[in-house]
Interface confidence: low
């Protein structure tokens, strides 16, 4: 039975109706919601404000690579992992929803999939979409964010993510990379970048760049498995460089700092 094929959804507007089927025990509900009363989101906003208030002046001090490279990449991996259990299905999941890395440093956006049938190699597609609204600006003006997001919450729509959920026609959409078998192909915009798909379906950047901010969708496509939760997404955010990120943002992992 041919069904949703390329991009079976993982979100609905209301965030309702999620289920975890017992035959898919490795599936998990969505780990994080960005709305005003979420403590972790508040910590992220507060931390971002602290970075700005400090004028990004603390820097990395003695680190020789710090000169002329005063930026930090915050990688928020907000992944949608509802699960359904049709007879033949792909299930896409992620292992680590939070990362912090430094601009020009490597980052891996984890994505793994499992299939109920494997007669042919599936295609892994990573697609970039720009944010629906400016997450960085919002991070430094939490009051306006709280007002909007609390309004959504009050409207009975707590699953709404204003940074991710909007029509593609009003934002930039690009294919980052695709993989079938051992062959990885970069999208036109990313040609020349040191980007690849490693492991099961992880997207790895050897060096992050300013233009990498946005939402990254991992999709797995198979002609045999045309149902299920074959999509997850991650948010990648680029901010100014500073020290103390790990302390400011508990639960985030700082990437390696290399010369």
């Amino acid at each position: 039975m041919q069904q949703d094929g390329l991009g079976v959804g993982t979100r609905n507007g209301s965030g309702k109706g999620r289920s975890v089927h017992p035959s898919w025990p490795w599936c998990a509900p969505r780990p994080l919601r960005y709305f005003g009363r979420d403590a972790r989101a508040r910590r992220a906003q507060t931390a971002a404000m602290a970075l700005l208030a400090g004028g990004l002046s603390r820097g990395l001090g003695s680190h020789p690579a710090a000169a002329g490279r005063d930026a930090v990449v915050f990688v928020w991996l907000l992944l949608s992992t509802w699960c359904t259990a049709p007879a033949r299905a792909i299930q896409v999941t992620v292992s680590n929803p939070y990362h912090v890395v430094i601009l020009f440093q490597p980052v891996t956006l984890p994505c793994t999939y499992q299939m109920t049938s494997t007669p042919t190699q599936p295609i892994v597609i990573w697609k970039y979409k720009s944010f629906c609204r400016d997450r960085i600006a919002d991070a430094f003006s939490p009051a306006s964010v709280d007002n909007q997001l609390n309004a959504q919450l009050a409207a009975g729509n707590p699953g709404y993510n204003p940074y991710v959920e909007c029509q593609d026609s009003v934002r930039t959409v690009r294919v980052v990379a695709t993989k079938q078998g051992n062959a990885v192909t970069l999208g036109d915009y990313y040609q020349g970048r040191r980007i690849t798909i490693t492991g099961n379906a992880d997207l790895t950047f050897d060096q992050t760049a300013w233009g990498d901010s946005g939402v990254y969708y991992c999709s797995v496509v198979s002609a045999q498995d045309l149902q299920g939760n074959n999509e997850a997404y991650a948010e990648l955010i680029v901010l100014g460089r500073t020290s103390g990120v790990a302390e400011l943002l508990p639960g985030f992992q700082a990437g390696p700092i290399e010369d």
Epitope: Q2, Q3, D4, G5, L6, G9, R11, T178, T185
Partner: antibody, heavy 114, light 106 residues
Framework: AVTLDESGGGLQTPGGALSLVCKAS????????MNWVRQAPSKGLEWVAG????????DYGAAVKGRATISRDNGQSTVRLQLNNLRAEDTATYYC????????WGHGTEVIVS | ALTQPASVSANPGETVKITCSGG????????YGWYQQKSPGSAPVTMI???NNRPSNIPSRFSGSLSGSTNTLTITGVQADEAVYYC??????????FGAGTTLTV
């Protein structure tokens, strides 16, 4: 049996907006990507817009990008196409079509922009 | 856009092959469909989807096959099958694209 019934066509004015609705039955609606495909008089088929099963992914053909919005209501088994700033070249029969590799079509609804 | 011949012709009982190429440009895999339109303005009918799947109401003499990036619609024992046949493919995740159509004359 799978049925797809389009409605909302008719005579439209340039610069105006139209809203087409497709009512589906006979299958588990939320499992399927849904599409709008159109055919101008004496022309070939043109893919207009698509939306995946749970509404998290939409895409649009180049001719309507920025003017079209596709949405769906899985509870009502309907998919809607909103097309703004209508042009004469939007005159066509609009078909609702099921699946990422289309396996079922509606009978179509005719839209005339004049 | 997809590439398919503008027209093909056959005698009744012969086998016809119509090719289509150019799909799947975004990610190296190919998902084609074939759609028959008997007359302008009539709704298309799916003959083949997902390269080689045939809807239950379509005769078995219609088949699809994929070789590399080219899909072929084969009609074995052509009958009153005069129509325009469009090939379609998935382009960039959920977007679709169609060929210009092939007119089959019997």
């Amino acid at each position: 049996a799978v049925t797809l019934d389009e409605s909302g066509g008719g005579l439209q004015t340039p610069g105006g907006a139209l809203s087409l609705v497709c009512k589906a039955s006979g299958f588990t609606f939320s499992d399927y990507q849904m599409n709008w495909v159109r055919q101008a008089p004496s022309k070939g088929l043109e893919w207009v817009a698509g939306i995946n099963g749970r509404s998290s992914w939409t895409d649009y053909g180049a001719a309507v990008k920025g003017r079209a919005t596709i949405s769906r209501d899985n509870g009502q088994s309907t998919v809607r196409l909103q097309l703004n700033n209508l042009r004469a070249e939007d005159t066509a029969t609009y078909y609702c079509a099921r699946g990422s590799s289309i396996d079922a079509w509606g009978h179509g609804t005719e839209v005339i922009v004049s | 856009a997809l590439t398919q011949p503008a027209s093909v012709s056959a005698n009744p009982g012969e086998t016809v092959k119509i090719t289509c190429s150019g799909g799947g440009s975004y990610y190296g895999s190919y998902y084609y469909g074939w759609y028959q339109q008997k007359s302008p303005g009539s709704a298309p009918v799916t003959m083949i989807y997902n390269n080689n799947n045939r809807p239950s109401n379509i005769p078995s003499r219609f088949s699809g096959s994929l070789s590399g990036s080219t899909n072929t619609l084969t009609i074995t024992g052509v009958q009153a099958d005069e129509a325009v046949y469009y090939c379609g493919s998935i382009d960039s995740n959920i977007a679709g694209v169609f060929g210009a159509g092939t007119t089959l004359t019997v």
